[in-house]
């Protein structure tokens, strides 16, 4: 069975693979494969080191830790929902049937849809209702919120009072919209 | 959720003999390389033997070479340590623990630890 | 044999940063892990591979490592963190311990 790991569409994934090597800088082959290892190899290949080095890799596909210490774990850049399934690390241990198999398998969600508001400080003071904060981990995401006891006639009056207004650019700067009615 | 029990854990007289299990769930025993882990009472820990993911290597501390063994079992999910020629010296809590790789050179980093057999040899 | 080296025991404040450090020779070449042991508990990962966090383990804790020493770093330390530190080394035929630091939250 699988390690499963997840990921949000945006971001980028990343699929843990360590090996010791037998001594500093004495490095193993490795190779990442799209699909469960099979007998021999790897499937799909998208990426390989070698003795020395990381020696064939496509687009979005690295290495971020110290492979030389046997850190080979793979990071996915910018993961779109196809890059979901299972991936295959492999140590290519000298010597027969001595491969390290890993069996990785990535679950991408999709990404939670919130506006990037610009100016937050102007935002927040004009409409002080308008925006709550919702923890995500580590970074925090600004969506707008709902109107709890204001009325759509004070709604079109602060409307129309910022309509000339700087925070009026911003709001259409940042893509976000207000409707009336 | 990985979980890792030890047993086999007594009281011993010197030159006796020991033979301790661990029984792994919640992950794939035999791609991970497995350790023995000692610990005596108020002193850190210290490791005593490693073994590859397939059972093929093994490696073991100075201070127990050619008296302890290490051995797993991939079909049963279960890491051994068979204990020979004990000696006060090897009192101590044995933790198993699970490595973090396939551990064919070494251990690498210990992800998961049991809570550990404690073992006493006395006379 | 290889040996790691710490200081017995390190005090920080609360909500301060502490360091706590695993000296070594040409450590840096190696890959460092640090575990964090609680009176009467098995010891848990908190570092691996360097500077790599496992999952569950808060942020607030960090790592590097280069030259000959090796650093585990607790931004914003909290009551909890109070334990006995590891770090942990292969070297060549065994994997090999520091005998440990003390972190004292006042």
């Known amino acids: 069975s699988e390690v499963e790991y997840r990921a949000e569409v945006g971001q980028n994934a990343y699929l843990p693979c360590f090996y010791t090597p037998a001594a500093p800088g004495n490095l193993v082959p490795v190779c990442w494969g799209k699909g469960a290892c099979p007998v021999f190899e790897c499937g799909n290949v998208v990426l390989r080191t070698d003795e020395r080095d990381v020696n064939y890799w496509t687009s979005r596909y690295w290495l971020n830790g110290d492979f030389r210490k046997g850190d080979v774990s793979l990071t996915i850049e910018n993961v779109t929902l196809a890059d979901s399934g299972i991936y295959c690390c492999r140590i290519q241990i000298p010597g027969i049937m001595n491969d390290e198999k890993f069996n990785l398998k990535l679950v991408i969600k999709p990404a939670k849809v919130t506006p990037a508001p610009t100016r937050q400080r102007d935002f927040t003071a004009a409409f002080p209702r308008m925006l709550t904060t919702r923890g995500h981990g580590p970074a925090e995401t600004q969506t707008l919120g709902s109107l709890p006891d204001i009325n759509l006639t004070q709604i079109s009056t602060l409307a129309n009072e910022l309509r000339d207004s700087r925070l009026a650019n911003d709001l259409r700067d940042s893509g976000a919209t207000i409707r009336i009615g | 959720e990985v979980q890792l029990v030890e047993s086999g854990g007594g009281l011993v007289q010197p030159g006796g003999s020991l033979r301790l299990s661990c029984a792994a769930s919640g992950f794939t025993f035999s791609s991970y390389a497995m350790s023995w882990v000692r610990q005596a009472p108020g002193k850190g820990p210290e490791w005593v033997s490693h073994i590859n993911s397939g059972g093929g290597n093994t490696k073991y501390a100075d201070s127990v070479k050619g008296r302890f063994t290490i051995s797993r079992d991939n079909a049963k999910n279960t890491l051994y340590l068979q204990m020979n020629t004990l000696k006060p010296e090897d009192t101590a809590v044995y933790y198993c623990?699970?490595?973090?790789?396939?551990?064919?050179?070494?251990?690498?980093?210990?992800?998961?630890w049991g809570q550990g057999t404690q073992v006493v040899v006395s006379s | 044999s290889y040996e790691l080296t710490q200081s017995p025991s390190v005090s920080v404040a609360l909500k301060q940063t502490a360091k706590i450090t695993c000296g070594g020779d040409n450590i840096g070449s190696k890959s460092a892990q640090w575990y964090q042991q609680k009176p009467g508990q098995a010891p848990v990962l908190v570092i691996y591979a360097d500077s790599r966090r496992p999952s569950g383990i808060p942020e607030r804790f960090s790592g590097s490592n280069s030259g000959n020493t090796a650093t585990l770093t607790i931004s914003g330390a909290q009551a909890e963190d109070e334990a006995d530190y590891y770090c942990q080394v292969w070297d060549s035929s065994a994997a090999v311990f520091g005998g440990g630091t003390h972190l004292t939250v006042l």
């Open positions: 623990a699970k490595d973090v790789s396939g551990g064919y050179y070494g251990t690498y980093a210990l992800d998961a």
